[in-house]
């Protein structure tokens, strides 16, 4: 058993049929010595008396809010949550496996630049009695500070018969060094509590590996005289790290016809303009990627040829 | 050329070669899915690699103030990785394919380190990998880790030379 926060405790249980469970001793936080009784949740049934209560925790019915009283007055509470371990593996019932970029990916994170700011998100089908708490650091043995906000519900989607809820959190490294080569990964830890079930999820990454620039901005076409060619120009996204002579991007320019089956013409360039042939009903799209490190491409910025 | 005395390197040549290094480092080991092997026991070989750290002066301001600190750090890293790529981790079994980009990568590391420090000039401290023979069964994982680490190192080096070529070239 360990303390998650004040008066909230997590009991770690090996979860299998007829498991013996864990013996837990609760102590009433009071100077009083006698006349103390214990109850669980809203029940008025007295579970025991005395300053301590010993219970055998085997299942969710044994978890919940234990309260000690004296003469009708509440002295203190202890909330017991269960953390299940099945076949040596901690349960992951609360969050959905996003399966990208690999199986058992519950947390996904992205950064728009090298400032040390990043966003993580996760999915669940649970809509009520759900709380999340997020902690983060750079490195684990001698951790350096990363400050995370509160997790918020950021999107709701309907997937077949189910509703899916997306939660996200923003974090910022306290002393970020954008130009340095990271040697210790960022660690993100999410505590998830659904009713009386506790689970924790972790992710470990370098900022450089989760970089995904915003799409290029101000995408414009300039027809060239007496030609089917156009000059496409764009700018670095505002959110990208500066100076651009140091934090450089590379770009992919694509000409795509109306039909998905039509052949796509692609040009790669380090410049912020390119000359392409604009076909009728086609559109021109540009996306960006870090020039020197192959992290994710941005989403496309597009304009119609006409 | 970054002679230890303090003259400027051939920024544009260094920029071109460092960008080629980035391309080679990724073609030598493309990011397969997101094959995250950081958990797989940190061997000394990959722990000891020199990193370009915050105080090394490789940020735009530091380069403006005095690029020598940063260039020395980059040189140190290039020599270190060049030695790693010549070690039995890469020359031993399982053999690299004859057309593997590792050979070109190796030559380019040497080329850039020589651009930074021509024959006959020496920066004092050198960090050299202390390499005990690697067991064949460890080598694929070690190669993966070294190349991932090299990708990060050459990305910073390429930024330094791109910025230098754009803003510090005579």
């Amino acid at each position: 058993i360990w303390e998650l926060k004040k008066d909230v405790y997590v009991v770690e249980l090996d979860w299998y049929p007829d498991a013996p469970g864990e013996m837990v001793v609760l102590t009433c936080d009071t100077p009083e010595e006698d006349g103390i009784t214990w109850t669980l949740d809203q029940s008025s049934e007295v579970l025991g008396s005395g300053k301590t209560l010993t219970i055998q925790v085997k299942e969710f019915g044994d978890a919940g809010q234990y309260t000690c009283h004296k003469g009708g007055e509440v002295l203190s509470h202890s909330l017991l949550l269960l953390h299940k371990k099945e076949d040596g593996i901690w349960s992951t019932d609360i969050l959905k496996d996003q399966k990208e970029p690999k199986n058992k990916t519950f947390l996904r994170c992205e950064a728009k630049n090298y400032s040390g700011r990043f966003t993580c998100w996760w999915l669940t089908t649970i809509s009520t009695d759900l709380t999340f708490s997020v902690k983060s650091s750079r490195g684990s043995s001698d951790p350096q500070g990363v400050t995370c906000g509160a997790a918020t519900l950021s999107a709701e989607r309907v997937r077949g018969d189910n509703k899916e809820y997306e939660y996200s959190v923003e974090c910022q490294e306290d002393s970020a060094c954008p130009a340095a080569e990271e040697s210790l990964p960022i660690e993100v830890m999410v505590d998830a509590v659904h009713k009386l079930k506790y689970e924790n999820y972790t992710s470990s990454f370098f900022i450089r590996d989760i970089i995904k620039p915003d799409p290029p901005k101000n995408l414009q076409l300039k027809p060239l005289k007496n030609s089917r060619q156009v000059e496409v120009s764009w700018e670095y996204p505002d959110t990208w790290s500066t100076p651009h002579s140091y934090f450089s991007l590379t770009f992919c320019v694509q000409v795509q016809g109306k039909s998905k089956r039509e052949k796509k013409d692609r040009v790669f360039t380090d410049k912020t303009s390119a000359t392409v042939i604009c076909r009728k009903n086609a559109s021109i799209s540009v996306r960006a990627q870090d020039r020197y490190y192959s992290s994710s491409w941005s989403e496309w910025a597009s304009v119609p040829c006409s | 050329r970054a002679v230890p005395g303090g003259s400027s390197p051939a920024w544009t040549q260094c920029q071109q070669l460092s960008q080629k290094l980035c391309t080679l480092a990724w073609s030598a080991h493309p990011l397969v899915g997101h094959m995250d092997l950081r958990e797989e026991g940190d061997e000394e070989t990959t722990n000891d690699v020199p990193h370009i750290q915050c105080g090394d002066g490789c940020d735009p301001q530091g380069l403006r103030d005095n690029s020598q600190f940063c260039l020395q750090r980059i040189h140190q890293g290039l020599i270190f990785y060049e030695k790693l790529l010549g070690s039995d981790i890469f020359t031993g079994e399982p053999s690299l394919l004859p057309d593997s980009p590792v050979g070109q990568l190796h030559a380019s590391l040497l080329g850039l380190s020589q651009l930074l420090q021509p024959e006959g000039h020496h920066w004092e401290t050198q960090q050299i990998p202390s390499l005990s023979p690697s067991q064949p069964w460890q080598r694929l994982l070690l190669r993966f880790k070294i190349l991932r680490s090299l990708q990060a190192f050459v990305a910073v080096a390429a930024r330094v030379f791109a910025h230098g070529a754009a803003t510090l070239s005579p």
Epitope: - | K83, G86, S87, T91, E93, G103, P133, P136
Partner: antibody, heavy 115, light 107 residues
């Protein structure tokens, strides 16, 4: 075409030393390790050690430490093995071979130690 | 050291027979196992690398299988020129060790 050409047979007296060579051609000498293997008459194969011609790093079978010394010369793409304090137990055919999985072996050097 | 045990020591076969040569490692060597053929007064010749990978120029009748500590070299239709001694080799860890060999004879 990859070839490993080994030096000719040696007849030496007990207590003496011998240095045999293995000249590589048809590939970049510094790209692969060079292993040395011993085979006594009518017996099996025994690994002696390897040299990395790129950096002259060596790795020996504990059994041959102090007996065999591996060196190489990049300029002539040649690997060498010196055997010291020879006894009749050292009489054998000695092979050089680049990385096991490349499948190229020298033709062998026959060493006879006899007074 | 990893001990490589080959069986049988000698195998007498008729041309056209399918034969299996066994090799056992004293501990797991994953698939880091190579097979060699050595004919009288010749250098060893690599037949199979990494337990099952074929080698260019080696007839397709030779194949390898196994992983961990149990390995097999199969010759699916023995030819008279296949006579010789077959060795398996631990390519997993130092010191590299060879089996004592299986001698293949033609009846």
């Amino acid at each position: 075409e990859v070839q490993l050409q080994q030096s000719g047979p040696e007849l030496v007296k007990p207590g003496a030393s011998v240095k045999m060579s293995c000249k590589a051609s048809g590939y970049t000498f510094t790209t692969y390790l060079m292993h040395w293997v011993k085979q006594k008459p009518g017996q099996g194969l025994e690994w002696i050690g390897y040299i990395n011609p790129y950096n002259d790093g060596t790795n020996y079978n504990e059994k041959f430490k102090g007996k065999a010394t591996l060196t190489s010369d990049k300029s002539s793409s040649t690997a060498y093995m010196e055997l010291s304090s020879l006894t009749s137990e050292d009489s054998a055919v000695y092979y050089c071979t680049k990385n096991w999985d490349k499948g190229y072996w020298g033709q062998g050097t026959t060493l006879t130690v006899s007074s | 050291d990893i001990v490589m045990t080959q069986s049988p020591a000698t195998l007498s076969v008729t041309p056209g027979d399918r034969v299996s040569l066994s090799c056992r490692a004293s501990q797991s060597i994953s698939d880091y196992l190579h097979w060699y053929q050595q004919k009288s007064h010749e250098s060893p010749r690599l037949l199979i690398k990494y337990a099952s990978q074929s080698i260019s120029g080696i007839p397709s009748r030779f194949s390898g299988s196994g992983s961990g500590s149990e390995f097999t070299l199969s010759i699916n239709s023995v030819e008279p020129e296949d006579v010789g001694v077959y060795y398996c080799q631990n390519g997993h860890s130092f010191p590299f060790t060879f089996g004592s060999g299986t001698k293949l004879e033609i009846k």
